[in-house]
């Protein structure tokens, strides 16, 4: 019994060659930016700006690039190895409980409260009670994995063991 495959297990020449249209799968898998052919013999490049794959895979198709919605700005475009990164426009934020839409930030705090945090693309303004300093229940915490991190070409979402 052995651990599941990681990028490091694969031959260096298989790790990525964006300029190549086709390469051979390694242990049945294709590198980020590619998908496997129907006959399993080739790795086919994703189409820049149309589709992508971020991980080693045996997908028959690359994943479709996300299109930013109205009310969003494109922080970085879709490449063959990374999906589009969209961010809410200024004055709006994406709530963790409803990530599919940007919501307007509040313009001010309720009476008796003071603003301690600004509107960001991932959180509403933060209000606390003047006296106690406790947060207003309407406050939305910032998302941990912010949109600025660059994934590179990861092998797997986490280390797996058999």
């Amino acid at each position: 019994e052995s651990a599941l495959i990681t990028q490091q297990d694969l031959a260096p020449q298989q790790r990525a060659a964006p300029q190549q249209k086709r390469s051979s799968p390694s242990e049945g898998l294709c590198p980020p930016g590619h998908h496997i052919s129907e006959d399993g013999r080739d790795c086919i490049s994703c189409k820049y700006g149309q589709d992508y794959s971020t991980h080693w895979n045996d997908l028959l198709f690359c994943l479709r690039c996300t299109r930013c919605d109205s009310g969003e700005v494109e922080l970085s475009p879709c490449t063959t190895t990374r999906n589009t990164v969209c961010q809410c426009e200024e004055g709006t934020f994406r709530e963790e409980d409803s990530p599919e839409m940007c919501r307007k930030c509040r313009t001010g705090c309720p009476r008796g409260m003071v603003k301690v945090g600004d509107c960001t693309p991932w959180s509403d303004i933060e209000c606390v009670h003047k006296e106690s300093g406790t947060k207003h229940s309407g406050e939305v915490p910032a998302v941990e994995e912010t949109v600025t991190s660059s994934p590179g070409t990861p092998a797997s979402p986490c280390s797996l063991s058999g």
């Epitope: 052995s2 599941l4 495959i5 049945g28 971020t54 797996l160």
Partner: antibody, heavy 121, light 111 residues
Framework: EVQLVESGGGLVQPGGSLRLSCAAS????????MSWVRQAPGKGLELVAA????????HYPDTVKGRFTISRDNAKNSLYLQMNSLRAEDTAVYYC??????????????WGQGTLVTVSS | DIVLTQSPDSLAVSLGERATINCRAS??????????MHWYQQKPGQPPKLLIY???NLESGVPDRFSGSGSRTDFTLTISSLQAEDVAVYYC?????????FGGGTKVEIK
């Protein structure tokens, strides 16, 4: 069209053994991860074993580790599950599946019709 | 292990109405802009069938009345206009972490 056909299920006593087979067609079998998923009567789904395209990488959950063995014969387009030391809680329909890989074994793209294994005295 | 909790356990929806199924993970299943959550449909006496992969990607051949959304720990499968053939049990499944785990299922019936 992808077809996965399981066989080998049946009634077995606790402590007994059984070998399940899965015949695959309509896909380049030697290119893909394969797996066995089971479903106890009226219950949910559980991954039992997974194997990569050349058989070099294998995974079992703790519930079956040391008792079940997954293997494949790419020349015969066949997947196997050897089940030893069977227990009443292993009673389930066992499905042969084609497991898509995306960064790690990820989702179950194709399923066979399943074969019923009953462990009872 | 990541535990997936589906809600409700069952729901009855009128034909043509919207059905919404939720799946909550015990920890985030997001990384590198991907949500490692997938959805299946299982009709009585049949094996499960893949509907949605990576939270929102519709599997080839699946009607577009099915859609998936969500991120991190909270995910939703929506059937925009329920049809008679959609009566089934629906399961979520995560592949962020070993072992791969499934939710307990949500039974969808016609009201």
């Amino acid at each position: 069209e992808v077809q996965l056909v399981e066989s080998g299920g049946g009634l077995v006593q606790p402590g007994g053994s059984l070998r399940l087979s899965c015949a695959a067609s309509g896909l380049p079998f030697n290119s893909y991860y394969m797996s066995w998923v089971r479903q106890a009567p009226g219950k949910g789904l559980e991954l039992v074993a997974a194997i990569n395209s050349n058989g070099g990488r294998i995974h079992y959950p703790d519930t079956v580790k040391g008792r079940f063995t997954i293997s494949r014969d790419n020349a015969k387009n066949s997947l196997y599950l050897q089940m030893n030391s069977l227990r009443a809680e292993d009673t389930a329909v066992y499905y042969c599946t084609r497991l898509t890989y995306y960064g790690n074994p990820a989702w179950f793209a194709y399923w066979g019709q399943g074969t019923l294994v009953t462990v009872s005295s | 292990d990541i535990v997936l909790t589906q809600s409700p356990d069952s729901l009855a929806v009128s034909l043509g109405e919207r059905a919404t199924i939720n799946c909550r993970a015990s920890e985030s299943v997001d990384i590198y802009g991907n949500s490692f959550m997938h959805w299946y449909q299982q009709k009585p006496g049949q094996p499960p069938k893949l509907l949605i992969y990576l939270s929102s990607n519709l599997e080839s051949g699946v009607p577009d009345r099915f859609s998936g959304s969500g991120s991190r720990t909270d995910f939703t499968l929506t059937i925009s206009s329920l049809q008679a053939e959609d009566v089934a049990v629906y399961y979520c499944q995560q592949s962020y972490e070993d072992p791969l785990t499934f939710g307990g299922g949500t039974k969808v019936e016609i009201k």
